[in-house]
Interface confidence: low
């Protein structure tokens, strides 16, 4: 807490500018004017202050605005927005998607922090749903975005914003996740030719259910090994030795690396050994 | 409700050893929580992932910190993880968490956030 003391003759300041990095945090408290700073806040980041300085500048905004900083000032916060904390950021009421941009770049590189996740968090619920600016958005600063978030919360994100999606988006997401984004995919693409729809639906097939890994059989796909072992379990474990070879084309000498891992470990105790012996990789049921 | 249970905590001087454990009440993987390790936090710190394994194969993931003293292994029978813990220094005082989650690598172990299931923790001291 600052302590309030009357600003030195002269030292009042008439616009936020680089002499007052020269200020001794009482004299940023007495002379800065908050209402001031609120229609300046753009300059505050082309300015070198200290951090506790920053500290200062962020006390003046909290008792100008102590309901929550409007989105003009929270647009041009620049790096004061890495002293905000998450109950700051519960109070703000953020719409645009360059507010939001904006703040990113200033987290940029580093780690989702809990601010971001705040901010995030009451910008989709602000939009009620993730659509597919916003995921463009997100994903962009943070592949692992889309796997952060529950299977609850994925199941607001609408269909048209998966094609937003890369599949280094979805490299940690975990079953569950994928079994609600699968079907927004499967809905999303169903209009493209069969090999482009391969290309696209891929990196989703962790959520596809037996039904579908057939239907793919008969398609030529040649799915990679990578692919294969994402799938999930129960969903393989149906599927017959030449529903696999079809589907794996030549890349079902792959097994042989596998055999020990599920869901191949398990797909091959489910199947008759005359039927594996078809497939000469030496597979034992 | 999926618990995982963790034991092996305690007081020790600087170079000795101690052995964590815990141990899923189910088989993960089935979930494709194919990820178990531990994370941990000293006091007014982050937390920070220490070691993980990815269940079934074996592949491990190291912090650099730990590199060299820790070693993480399974016992897929018994649904545990063990992390034995050597030339302890006191920087590695901290409460340690067991967590599991899916990844991709086991690379991936890293992120908090991504974590499935999380352990009550188990505090190591380690005095000079």
């Known amino acids: 807490e600052v302590e309030k003391t009357a600003c030195p003759s002269g030292k009042k300041a008439r616009e936020i500018d680089e002499s007052l990095i020269f200020y001794k945090k009482w004299e940023l408290e007495a002379c800065v004017d908050a209402a001031l700073l609120a229609t300046q806040m753009d300059r505050v980041n082309a300015i070198p202050f200290t951090y506790e300085q920053l500290d200062v500048l962020k006390h003046k905004l909290d008792e100008l605005y102590p309901q929550g900083y409007p989105e003009s000032v929270i647009q041009h916060l620049g790096y004061l927005f890495l002293k905000m904390s998450p109950e700051d950021i519960r109070k703000w009421n953020v719409t645009s998607l360059e507010t939001l941009k904006a703040l990113l770049e200033v987290n940029k590189g580093h780690e989702m922090s809990p601010q971001v996740a705040t901010l995030i968090d009451r910008f989709v619920k602000g939009r009620g749903q993730l659509d597919k600016d916003t995921l463009d958005t997100l994903t962009a600063f943070y592949p692992g975005y889309l796997c952060s978030l529950s299977p609850e919360e994925l199941s607001s994100v609408p269909p048209s914003s998966i094609w937003a999606v890369r599949p280094q988006d979805l490299d940690t997401c975990d079953p569950r996740q994928l079994d609600v984004l699968y079907p927004k995919a499967r809905l999303a693409f169903q209009n493209m030719n069969g090999s482009e729809y391969f290309v696209k639906i891929q990196s989703f097939l962790g959520g596809a259910p037996t039904e579908d890994l057939k239907a793919l059989s008969q398609q030529n796909v040649s799915m990679d090994l990578a692919t294969f072992m994402k799938l999930r379990t129960d969903a393989v474990l149906p599927l017959t030795v030449a529903e696999v070879q079809k589907l794996l084309g030549p890349h079902v000498e792959g097994l042989k690396a596998e055999e020990r891992h599920r869901p191949v470990r398990d797909w091959i105790l489910r199947q008759r050994q005359d039927d594996l012996d078809t497939l000469g990789l030496g597979l034992q049921g | 409700q999926v618990q995982l249970v963790e034991s092996g905590g305690g007081s020790v001087q600087a170079g000795g050893s101690l052995r964590l454990s815990c141990t899923a009440s189910?088989?993960?993987?089935?979930?494709?929580?194919?990820?178990m390790g531990w994370f941990r936090q000293a006091p007014g710190k982050e937390r920070e992932a220490v070691a993980a394994i990815y269940t079934g194969r074996g592949t491990t993931y190291y912090a650099d910190s730990v590199k060299g003293r820790f070693t993480i292994s399974q016992d897929n029978a018994k649904n545990t993880v063990y992390l034995q813990m050597n030339s302890l220094k006191p920087e590695d005082t901290a409460m340690y968490y067991c967590?599991?989650?899916?990844?991709?690598?086991?690379?991936?172990?890293?992120?908090?956030?991504?974590?499935?299931?999380w352990g009550q923790g188990t505090q190591v001291t380690v005095s000079s």
């Open positions: 967590a599991s989650k899916y990844c991709a690598v086991v690379a991936d172990f890293g992120n908090s956030r991504l974590v499935r299931y």
């Open positions: 189910e088989d993960l993987s089935i979930y494709g929580y194919n990820c």
